[in-house]
């Protein structure tokens, strides 16, 4: 009997009231592999998540999160609102970085400024609550006649986080 | 898929340099940071420090000021980790790890790891 | 600087719980994030932001932070899930950004 079961394909189950026989997965639920016993009901995305993929009858529904909130956990199974850049959210909600610290993305923390001087570099350009200092060349490189440095390139794009 | 490969394994003498690169494929090299971190024989995880490698700007633990540097080469998706004034001490394995795109995460991709041995 | 402790060890029956402990100074009010470790491999993180799993890291671990203690919890432990355990947090301080705790080795019985 396990052996009839075994050849239902994925988007079928096995259904146990009908001698076994492959039936087709009802609406609003899937099975991703075959020999299933039961489909899944698909996830639906509601509230704070929106729909990025629509369920089919082998595979679940994908999430994402609306506007203003991002994705946390395998398979954006929570939504975390954004901040600002120039802030950080805490356990009590989002707050300006502190002084020497930035945040150029609307989620995490504030991170401290770059120290040039551990490079051997000056501060080209000073820092704020959305940007990092821009460091330039060393002090001993502005005497008269030493060529200007060119300024790196600007803030990175946002990444993605670890899901 | 994203992948971090390291340089091989170094032996060097007491006060010497070791330079440790990490090749990145797989991703926007530029986008993400990218940290440090070593293991010495039977001690734990420690974090060393992180680079830019949009613009090259650094941040340092304390512990390394000083004989720690990290760079990072854009054109070839490589960052690096030079250790001066090597001690017995320094004997570790060192990571690459990529900072997920947002300061506050945890670091979700990993190097394979170099062992760099310091012995006279 | 910011310390993190946790125990040197934790034993435990194939099947049953295991839970890892990490203490810090108010860390309910930091994102702690949690690596798994074993010899001769890099880390791998299986738990970030207090609570999360990364893609591809079963259910059955599972993590919280609150007070002074942050934990991890590995339910039905199997024997694939001995190594060593770290704790991890981001300060916004410029003198040690990245702290890590001590480690724990969770030892599987049996």
């Known amino acids: 009997l396990q052996d009839l079961c075994s050849n239902c394909p994925a988007g079928t189950f096995c259904d146990n009231n009908r001698s076994q026989i492959c039936s087709p997965c009802p609406p609003n639920s899937f099975s991703s592999a075959g020999g299933q016993r039961t489909c899944d009901i698909c996830r639906q995305c509601k509230g704070v998540f929106k729909t990025r993929k629509e369920c089919s009858s082998t595979s679940n529904a994908e999430c994402d999160c609306i506007s203003g909130y991002h994705c946390l956990g395998a398979e954006c199974s929570m939504c975390e609102q954004d901040c600002k850049q120039g802030q950080e959210l805490t356990k009590k909600g989002c707050k300006d970085c502190c002084f020497g610290t930035f945040n150029d993305q609307k989620r995490g923390i504030c991170r401290p400024w770059t120290n040039c001087s551990l490079d051997g570099k000056s501060v080209l350009v000073n820092g704020t609550k959305e940007r990092d200092v821009v460091c330039g060349p060393s002090p001993a490189d502005l005497s008269p006649g030493a060529s200007s440095a060119t300024p790196p390139a600007p803030a990175r794009e946002p990444g993605h986080s670890p899901q | 898929q994203v992948q971090l490969v390291q340089s091989g394994a170094e032996v060097k003498k007491p006060g010497a340099s070791v330079k440790v690169s990490c090749k990145a494929s797989?991703?926007?090299?530029?986008?993400?940071?990218m940290h440090w971190v070593r293991q010495a024989p039977g001690q734990g995880l420690e974090w060393m420090g992180w680079?830019?490698?949009?613009?090259?700007?650094?941040n340092y633990a304390q512990k390394f000021q000083g004989r720690v540097t990290m760079t990072r080469d854009t054109s070839i998706s490589t960052a690096y980790m030079e250790l001066s004034r090597l001690r017995s001490d320094d004997t570790a394995v060192y990571y690459c790890?990529?900072?997920?795109?947002?300061?506050?995460?945890?670091?979700?991709?990993w190097g394979q790891g170099t062992l760099v041995t310091v012995s006279s | 600087s910011y310390v993190l402790t946790q125990p040197p060890s934790v034993s435990v029956a194939p099947g049953e719980t295991a839970r890892i402990t990490c203490g810090g100074d108010?860390?309910?009010?930091?994102?702690v994030h949690w690596y798994q470790k074993k010899p001769d491999q890099a880390p791998v993180l299986v738990v970030y932001?207090?609570?999360y799993r990364p893609s591809g890291i079963p259910e059955r671990i599972s993590g919280s932070n609150s007070g002074n203690t942050a934990t991890l919890t590995l339910s039905r432990v199997e024997a694939g899930d001995e190594a060593d355990y770290y704790c991890?947090?981001?300060?916004?301080?410029?003198?040690?950004?990245?702290?890590f705790g001590g480690g724990t080795q969770l030892i599987i019985l049996g």
């Open positions: 108010d860390i309910g009010d930091k994102r």
């Open positions: 797989g991703y926007s090299f530029t986008g993400y940071y």
């Open positions: 680079i830019n490698p949009n613009s090259g700007g650094t």
């Open positions: 991890q947090v981001w300060n916004s301080s410029s003198d040690h950004p990245g702290v």
């Open positions: 790890a990529r900072e997920p795109g947002y300061y506050g995460s945890g670091l979700d991709y």
């Open positions: 932001e207090d609570r």
